[in-house]
Amino acid sequence: APTSSSTKKTQLQLEHLLLDLQMILNGINNYKNPKLTRMLTFKFYMPKKATELKHLQCLEEELGPLEEVLNLAQSKNFHLRPRDLISNIRVIVLELKGSETTFMCEYADETATIVEFLNRWITFCQSIISTLT
């Protein structure tokens, strides 16, 4: 059974991930972002189901494309270089989902824009955090 300290750690990691995803979304939605139109052409894959930490596998598999999209944006839109930002997110995702369990992600048929994709994972983080508090 999860201890209160492990639950607290999970909650903090999810809050960190949530903040990173929100920061990316805000940077992309910045009205000064000249690359937004092109960014919206990138197709992202959404999980069929995302209710548990193991489902973060689906997010991990989209972090490569996410880094490429962020490379299009002006660096001043973000506090970190895309490579460093995604590296940080990868570390958090790996700790949350675990590296040993090989969960096969199932994707929804419909693809999404980067904005829809980020909103989906922001909602996921908020949902899990609410169950922990």
Epitope: F42, Q57, E60, E61, E68, V69, L94, M104
Partner: antibody, heavy 123, light 107 residues
Amino acid sequence: QVQLVQSGAEVKKPGATVKISCKVSGDTITAYYMHWVRQAPGQGLEWIGRIDPDDDSTKYAENFKGRVTITADTSTDTAYMELSSLRSEDTAVYYCTTITFLYTRELRWFAYWGQGTLVTVSS
Amino acid sequence: DIVLTQSPATLSLSPGERATLSCQASQYIGNYLSWYQQKPGQAPRLLIYQATSLASGIPARFSGSRSGTDFTLTISSLEPEDFAVYYCLQHYSTPYTFGQGTKLEIK
């Protein structure tokens, strides 16, 4: 169906520069990141670098930085790879290949390849 | 840089047999691994992407699996046209790196 057609074989002397082309047909080049990979005779595959033809941003492998320049001409849907200060170890088949994030998950990998261009460096 | 180690270097089998090719990553790369087949004088051909997904037009006898940082390409029953060199490739971070290859030859 996307096709990549590369320029013909080249023979160069040590110290010279070679420029190889890769023409994309069946789609516009701006939909793809154009990557270059090489293979020395009887050896494995080695990633050189890539260009985003839409904004000309590039990434190069450390081994090639300073010697390689990847460019693209969107008006002709053609990518180029120029390698300077050639040495005998650069003798290899050079391939262009693609990645895109606009279509299916499969095309995020090296799904389309050119036929390869043999570059021979010999004095 | 991430190092991919393929084994064995050469695999000698007969048509109809099962082939198991291994690729080990020097660090965690998630599912960011693909497999390619290359025949003499030809460009590589994508077989498996995202560690386990079969590329379009590739026969179902090819399959990919992953356990941690160990990846496996399995050919369930070898056909004569399957004898070639196989490479794994990681897309987790640049520089993208390939394994040194496994040559699958007829016994």
